[in-house]
């Protein structure tokens, strides 16, 4: 298992909520890529493919998100000051061989100008 | 260790139906992609049909779309394969096998159809 | 369907010579970085075995005198020293997209 913090922008903020950008590289072709707040599982997507080389994507801890062929984007909304934590990227790697699990990661800051507007 | 066990072969005249069972154990059995490969006696071998993890996605041969159903049960962790209108041309020792990502990894000892009047 | 062709259809090779297994196939099976071919040994009375993934790359337990190579749509299998318990038959296989297909398969004896 490889640790490290994410070296891209991995936070991008919009309309009160983020958007957590897991980046994976673009030789992978079959994955799950799992986003931890801490050690909480809060967001899952499997990616695999079966004999006929047909795509399944699956989710067991559903969120909003989105797959390219280099990342996956996990969206939460609806943001307040909770919201702030460590939030990592855990990719396990099943194709091409060998199996590899790595983690990255960093600090969700939560700063007043990001959060839900309200109206008065 | 994984083991996958056919069952359900037998004799069956032509236009009747049989039911193929593989008992699945040793690996997580929701987390994998599952097929059937038949083998006529004395050929080589043919893909029959495959599922994706949940069952929501299968994948039929030509030559038996229509007729047989790839069906599985991930809380017994079983695979089957029903099979409807089956004809002499059927006739083949049919595998249960698991997709291992890049090939079929596993495979079953098989169980023989066999269809004849 | 991509259409997959092994030959010879079967070669008697001496015990520790080389024995080189062709394929080809209808269609490149070439895609980004891989080429989506595996090769299988099926010993008599037994099911098929897993020996090649990618064209070239070798399933674990399968011992190094098993090698695969090949591009787009040639490929070989190659046994550098042929065992006793090589006596098989090995077929190609492609997931390039479905239907998936096996080559007819080539035999392999002891001559």
């Known amino acids: 298992e490889i640790n490290g913090s994410a070296n891209y922008e991995m936070f991008i903020f919009h309309n009160g909520g983020v958007q957590i950008l897991c980046k994976y590289p673009d030789i992978v072709q079959q994955f799950k890529m799992q986003l931890l707040k801490g050690g909480q599982i809060l967001c899952d997507l499997t990616k695999t493919k079966g004999s006929g080389n047909t795509v399944s994507i699956k989710s067991l801890k559903f969120c909003h998100s989105q797959l390219s062929n280099n990342s996956v984007s996990f969206f939460l909304y609806n943001l307040d000051h909770s919201h702030a934590n460590y939030y990592f990227c855990n990719l396990s790697i099943f194709d091409p061989p060998p199996f590899k699990v790595t983690l990255t990661g960093g600090y969700l800051h939560i700063y007043e100008s990001q959060l839900c507007c309200q109206l008065k | 260790e994984v083991q996958l066990v056919e069952s359900g072969g037998g004799l069956v005249q032509p236009g009747g139906s049989l039911r193929l069972s593989c008992a699945a154990s040793?690996?997580?059995?929701?987390?994998?992609?599952m097929d059937w490969v038949r083998q006529a006696p004395g050929k080589g071998l043919v893909w029959v049909s495959n599922?994706?993890?949940?069952?929501?996605?299968?994948e039929y041969s030509p030559f038996v779309k229509g007729r047989f159903t790839i069906s599985r049960d991930n809380a017994k962790n079983t695979l089957y394969l029903q099979m409807n209108s089956l004809r002499a041309e059927d006739t083949a020792v049919y595998y249960c096998?698991?997709?291992?990502?890049?090939?079929?990894?596993?495979w079953g000892q098989g169980t023989l159809v066999t269809v004849s009047s | 369907d991509i259409v997959m062709t092994q030959s010879p259809d079967s070669l008697a090779v001496s015990l520790g010579e080389r024995a080189t297994i062709n394929c080809k196939s209808s269609q490149s099976l070439l895609s980004g970085s891989f080429n989506y071919l595996t090769w299988y040994q099926q010993k008599p009375g037994q099911p098929p075995k897993l020996l090649i993934f990618y064209a070239s790359t070798r399933q674990t337990g399968v011992p190094d005198r098993f090698s695969g190579s090949g591009s787009g749509t040639d490929f070989t299998l190659t046994i550098s020293s042929l065992q006793a318990e090589d006596v098989a038959v090995y077929y190609c296989?492609?997931?390039?997209?479905?239907?998936?297909?096996f080559g007819p398969g080539t035999k392999v004896d002891i001559k």
């Open positions: 040793g690996f997580t059995f929701s987390d994998y992609w």
């Open positions: 599922i994706d993890e949940s069952g929501s996605i299968t």
């Open positions: 096998t698991r997709w291992g990502r890049f090939g079929f990894d596993s």
């Open positions: 296989h492609h997931h390039y997209n479905a239907p998936p297909t």
